[in-house]
Every structure is written in C-alpha cells, then in structure tokens.
C-alpha cells in the first residue's frame, strides 16, 4: 500500500472545569512504515513550534514505553501509545491558567530523522 503522509488529527477544542481532569486527543499518521526506532513525544502550550513545552517523553528503539522527561507540575500524563500513533495527553487538576491552546509533536531519530507538529492545536477551555 502507498506510504501515508504526515498528518495530525486534534479536535478544535476541549472543555473542562477547574479542578477536574481533561484529555487532549492527538493522533497522527506518518510515512515511515514499520518504524520502531527512537521516538520523542512533545506537547507545548501557547503557540506551535516555539511555545513552552509542558510534556515530553522518549521511547527507546524497539520499546513502547515513552519515558516521561518533563511533566509541568507533574500534572501531564501520556494516555496514548505513541507507537500506535496516539499522543493523547491527560491534564490533571486543571487551573484557569491552563486555558490556552496546546500543540502535539512527534520526533523520530535513529535511522530516520523526521518530525511533525500540529499547526492549529487543540484549544483547552477551563471554566
């Protein structure tokens, strides 16, 4: 079958109440069929490509375990399995300051060097 292109699917917005938890869905497709090399998953806030990272994890070659390297205030946790093209993120103990736009990003390293980031992101509304 023909190789898939890079794409990312996120909903336009997610709403939740302060003090509750929210899930920010993000799935992706990529052209590197059967890729099992090193992988990094990143979520950033505010603006794409340049906003501050709120979550980052890395998976070693051949591993499904994406080891958390950064979770701002310990409130961000990956629910999705990046090896299954899912970067969905859970945000715990929501505060009004979390009301902003979030962008998911995946990076491949090793034999393949490639990366992709959602351009429009998902807007989290905290009420």
């Amino acid at each position: 079958s023909p190789a898939q292109r890079w794409s990312m699917q996120v909903p336009p917005e997610v709403s939740a109440e302060a003090g509750d938890a929210a899930v920010l869905p993000c799935t992706f497709t990529h052209p590197h069929r059967h890729y099992d090399g090193p992988l990094t998953a990143i979520w950033r806030a505010g603006e794409p490509y340049a906003g501050p990272q709120v979550f980052r994890c890395a998976a070693a070659r051949g591993s499904e375990l994406c080891q958390t390297a950064l979770s701002l205030h310990g409130r961000f946790r990956l629910l999705g399995n990046p090896r299954r093209n899912d970067l969905s993120l859970r945000v715990e103990r929501l505060a009004l300051a979390d009301d902003r736009r979030y962008f998911c990003r995946v990076e491949f390293a090793g034999d393949v060097h490639d990366r992709y980031e959602s351009r429009h992101g998902v807007r989290l509304h905290v009420t």
């Epitope: 799935t27 059967h34 099992d36 591993s63 375990l65 629910l79 999705g80 090896r83 299954r84 093209n85």
Partner: antibody
C-alpha cells in the same frame, strides 16, 4: 528458544510485600519491554506495568502505581515485580510477558509460567 | 481507562462449527487490539495481533476483524483443542486493558 521462567509460589500475610522474579533466556534481554500482568482466581487479566530493560525506564498502571515497583538486573537477564501493602484481593497469579515486535507491531509473544501469590492471615 | 467488553461470556459450539466472539471498546482504539487464548493452568497465548494479523504458527481457522470500537475473533471450524477462554486486549492507550474473557466449550 525464548523462555521466561518465574519464581515459585508465595504465601504472604496482609500488609507484607512480595517480590516475584522472571528470568529471561533465548533473546537479547535489554531490547524488549517486559510487562507484568496479573489474574485473580477465576478472573480476567490485568496489566500492571512495564519496564524497558535497556534503559530501566518504567511505566505503571495508575491503579498500582503507589504499591508496585518493577526492576531489572541485566547481568542476569531477570525482571522483578515487587508489590507492597498486600491485601487479600492481591491473591492472584502474576505473569511476566515479553512485548515482542514485528514490522512495527508490538504484542505479548512470550509469557512466564505464572507465580501464584496467596495473601492470607 | 478503556473498557473492553466481550460478548458472549460463554459459548457452546459443535465441533466443526463456527464460533464468533465480539469485543467492544469504550472508545476508538484504532486497529490496536490483540486476541489471546488461555487454557486452564497455562499462561495466555497470542493468536491475533493488530486486529487482523495471525501470529506465527496459529492455525488459519482463527481470524480477526474490526477497527475503531468493534472487533471480532472467529474460529471458522471449532476443534476440540480450541476449548479455552479467549481475551481481547487494547494497546492504543495506557494502561493496556483486557476484556473479561469468553469461555468456549464444545456443545
């Protein structure tokens, strides 16, 4: 051939801890994730957590996160699962399982024989 | 956590007949469902991975289908050695979760 051989049955009192071992052979141990899955008597399967032996990185089911510790000793190709503050509901068969890999697909391809842990006062 | 619900809980099928087991996920898990067979006193054994792929050495009477939230394991012609409990498992989200199991017996 790939084999995962687990330690023998254990009987523990409530509040105690248990440490179950899983010795791997027949493959390059650091390359493959090892998960732990438990099964209460007559019940279904429950994933507890995973370790990547190459890095020592771990991931846990939130349900067990406060009580379970998964470690490895790469020199002996052995994975360990320690569960603390045992209660009667922890009585179960505990399995280790290798997370195999083929062309970008992951699956549990080899399992240990299981270790029965009985929690009783 | 994702809830995987299997139906039926048990199934009695005549030798040589078809057995069908369904598994429904509480949300979209793509094609990321595996099927395992477990016989009494033994660990589970992989049958199908990624919804449709038969694992090495598994007889071709076992097949899997589905994506999204609905998945099916089919045994096209039941043999005596197929008596077991069958589990689906999703690996799209952490924690990985299993169905409650379906017991297959001979009618």
């Amino acid at each position: 051939q790939v084999q995962l051989v687990q330690s023998g049955a254990e009987v523990k009192k409530p509040g105690a801890s248990v440490k179950v071992s899983c010795k791997a052979s027949g493959y390059t141990f650091p390359r493959y994730d090892v998960s732990w899955v438990r099964q209460a008597p007559g019940q279904g399967l429950e994933w507890m957590g995973v370790i990547h032996p190459g890095s020592g990185g771990t991931g846990y089911n939130e349900k067990f996160k406060a009580r379970v510790t998964i470690t490895v000793d790469t020199s002996t190709s052995t994975a360990y699962m320690e569960l603390s503050s045992l209660r009667s509901e922890d009585t179960a068969v505990y399995y280790c399982a290798r997370r195999g890999l083929n062309k970008g697909y992951w699956f549990f391809d080899f399992w240990g024989q299981g270790t029965l842990v009985t929690v009783s006062s | 956590d994702i809830v995987m619900t299997q139906s039926p809980d048990s199934l009695a099928v005549s030798l040589g007949e078809r057995a069908t087991i369904n598994c429904k996920a509480s949300q979209n898990v793509g094609s990321n469902v595996d099927w395992y067979q477990q016989k009494p006193g033994q660990p589970p054994k992989l049958l199908i991975y990624e919804s449709t792929n038969r694992y090495t050495g598994v007889p071709d009477r076992f097949s899997g289908s589905g994506s999204g939230t609905d998945f099916t394991l089919t045994i096209s012609s039941l043999q005596a050695e197929d008596v077991a409990v069958y589990y689906c498992m999703q690996s799209n989200f952490f924690p990985f979760t299993f169905g409650q199991g379906t017991k297959v017996e001979i009618k």
